[in-house]
């Protein structure tokens, strides 16, 4: 008799996919026509990458570090109208894209909460959370809250209010924090609350670092849901090395958790890497006009038209990512265990009862690693086969589909490895 | 124009009940938080409870907590506040008041008020 | 709670004075104060939020200002209209209170 079905885990939309930052409207859109209105024009290329909610803002009036010219319920005008945004909801609503709202007070300001008293500014979110949930967002961000003195009572009370018009509503903190025992004491007490930080971004990038941070995360979060990124708002390129961003995505799209990008991520997008760039919002390259001023200075490479017409590129490898990591059981859900592996190398196995198995195979360093996959730690649940299909590579040169023999297997520099098995009772 | 009119008062005995009423007009009111405030005679104006424009959050002074509740319905743009177990020390004219939707809280605009007098 | 005094409960001032009429808070509330008028017939009016900011409206000669804990409303040059009595609030945490009132008469 066929073994019983293991039965599925509860499934919030967040967990079926990756969330997209849009931090700054203008920017995303390019020089000068960043609005509501044109955000809307955009929203097949966000289907085109499967991404599963928009964390959209701040969009609120906000005059810099000013109490009594902040407004969380109007929408600047430079953004457009509240009519706009309604209208940006439906369309995103029809394309299976969740958006979420960033209510940072004083994004304009130095600090995000202003300097002053605290109490009076939460009482005016609560209200803003009311609102907007009415108005049909799905969810709220709210950044630096290391800021906010009793962030975590703050927090409680906004989920409350957030869960409490929806348990389909979502809840994302930001921190700057790296700290893990400050991540853990505000995850407490919020049990449904995604917090975005700086954690991973500590890093010294190497396969054995980052192992030891993935599993002392997950150990001290529990059961809980996790969120991977390396900060709470910036870009890939602001702290990884170039030569790692094709193997962080792939880190963070098969990770146990939701990922989450900032624009840009997905083509390799740098802080500041043109000239009269603000660092914190580098216009989208969405193709080669995307910065007149300059002729010349953007290749056809570095925008979306050039890596949309590129297998090899990161852009497509984002999407094959993305599209796997919303459809197959064992990366929507599945158990996560790592296992010893060549020094440099970080390597895992995410699987789901008898569904398609996967193995997660990172060389971190500079040179071509062996593999070395010891599979002696894992549970039976999770044994290692002889060999795997290759899914994908992050480096050019391999055939997708290709039998691979896992004794045998071999890394290039900075390669990661996504490979798949099926289940064998 | 903003418009906030206060009704409902009147002569109640002590431990009676009274619902007040305030229509507002010219603004959206879904939009706004609403207050009552009462002011009792010749003392000076004392914050009573708050509702948010979805009536979400709920706030209360401790004098009266448990005894009066504030409530609204938005498509009549009607505030309320229904007082119960009512004391000699109720006795006020009672104002509703719009709450600004900037972050520096205020009082906005105010109705003309209305008197309850607790006595028997 | 947080306790607001205003020290002086009545006021004599000639039209055209400039008068200023004083309110503290028991703690820091971090320029949340608010002042209101109240005519004689009742009528409750906003003149200045966060301090310092006039209400739309509100004629130029009020001014507010202060910091931490003490704060002032001035009037520059005093008309008969201003005849009334005049409340801070503190808006920065709840319950919202307010100060026990100056009542401004003509001498």
């Known amino acids: 008799r066929a073994p019983r079905c293991r039965e599925l885990p509860a499934q919030k939309w967040w967990h079926t996919g990756a969330l997209y930052r849009i931090g700054d409207l203008q920017a995303f859109q390019g020089h000068g026509s960043g609005n509501l209105a044109g955000l809307k024009g955009r929203l097949d290329y966000l289907s085109s990458l499967k991404v599963k909610g928009l964390v959209l803002g701040p969009l609120h009036k906000n005059q810099k570090d000013d109490v009594a010219q902040t407004d969380l319920l109007q929408i600047d005008p430079n953004f457009g109208s509240k009519e706009d945004f309604d209208n940006l909801l439906q369309s995103a609503k029809k394309k299976s894209i969740r958006v979420i709202l960033d209510l940072t007070p004083n994004y304009r300001g130095e600090n995000l909460w202003f300097s002053t008293q605290v109490d009076s500014v939460a009482t005016k979110v609560k209200d803003a959370l009311e609102f907007w949930l009415q108005a049909g967002v799905d969810g709220f961000q709210v950044r630096d809250i290391e800021n906010l003195k009793d962030a975590s009572s703050f927090l409680a009370e906004w989920e409350n209010i957030t869960k409490g018009f929806s348990e389909d509503r979502l809840l994302i903190a930001g921190t700057n924090s790296s700290d893990l025992q400050q991540i853990v004491s505000l995850l407490e007490s919020n049990k449904d609350l995604l917090l975005t930080s700086s954690y991973l971004s500590d890093s010294s990038f190497t396969g054995e670092h980052t192992k030891s941070l993935v599993t002392q995360y997950l150990n001290a979060t529990g059961n809980r849901w996790c969120s991977w990124s390396l900060s709470q708002a910036g870009l890939l390129t602001s702290f990884l090395p170039a030569q790692l961003l094709r193997l962080y995505q792939l880190m963070l799209f098969t990770l146990p958790g939701t990922p989450v990008f900032s624009y840009g991520d997905e083509i390799g997008l740098k802080a500041a890497a043109l000239p009269g760039q603000p660092v914190e919002a580098p216009v989208m390259l969405w193709d080669e006009s995307s910065f007149p001023d300059i002729p010349g200075a953007v290749s056809a490479n570095m925008t979306v038209k050039g890596q949309s017409e590129d297998p090899g590129s990161l852009l497509s490898l984002f999407r094959q990512l993305s599209d796997q990591r919303s459809k197959e059981r064992s990366l929507l859900h599945g158990d996560f265990h790592t296992f010893s592996s060549g020094p440099g190398l970080f390597s895992y196995i995410r699987h789901w009862d008898q569904n398609e198995r996967f193995l997660v195979v990172l060389n971190f360093g500079d040179v071509g690693l062996s593999a070395g996959l010891q599979a002696s730690d894992l549970p039976a649940s999770a044994s290692l086969p002889t060999k795997a299909d290759l899914v994908l590579s992050t480096q050019p040169g391999r055939e997708e589909g290709s039998p691979l023999e896992l004794e045998r297997l071999k890394l290039e520099p900075h390669e990661g490895l996504l490979l798949r098995f099926p289940y064998v009772a | 124009d903003v418009q906030l009119v206060e009704s409902g008062g009147g002569l109640v005995q002590p431990g009676g009940s009274r619902k007040l009423s305030c229509a507002a007009s010219?603004?959206?009111?879904?939009?706004?938080?609403m207050h009552w405030v009462r002011q009792a005679p010749e003392k000076g104006l004392e914050w009573v409870a708050y509702i948010s424009g979805g009536s979400t959050n709920i706030y209360y002074a401790d004098t009266v907590k448990g005894r009066f509740t504030i409530s609204r319905d938005n498509p009549k743009n009607t505030l309320f506040l229904q007082m119960t177990s009512l004391r000699s020390e109720d006795t006020a004219m009672y104002y509703c008041?719009?709450?600004?939707?900037?972050?520096?809280?205020?009082?906005?605009?105010w109705g003309q008020g209305t008197t309850l007098t607790v006595s028997s | 709670d947080i306790q607001m005094t205003q020290t002086t409960s009545s006021l004599s001032a000639s039209l055209g004075d400039r008068v200023t009429i004083s309110c503290r808070a028991s703690q820091d509330i971090s320029n949340y104060l608010n002042w209101y008028q109240q005519k004689p017939d009742g009528t409750v009016k906003l003149l200045i939020y966060?301090?310092?900011r006039l209400h739309s409206g509100v004629p130029s000669r009020f001014s507010g200002s202060g910091s931490g804990t003490d704060y002032s409303l001035t009037i520059s040059n005093l008309e008969q209209e201003d005849i009334a009595t005049y409340f801070c609030?503190?808006?920065?945490?709840?319950?919202?209170?307010f100060g026990g009132g100056t009542k401004l008469e003509i001498k």
């Open positions: 008041a719009r709450e600004t939707t900037l972050l520096a809280t205020n009082f906005d605009y």
């Open positions: 010219g603004f959206t009111f879904s939009t706004f938080g």
């Open positions: 609030q503190q808006g920065s945490t709840l319950p919202r209170t």
């Open positions: 966060y301090t310092s």
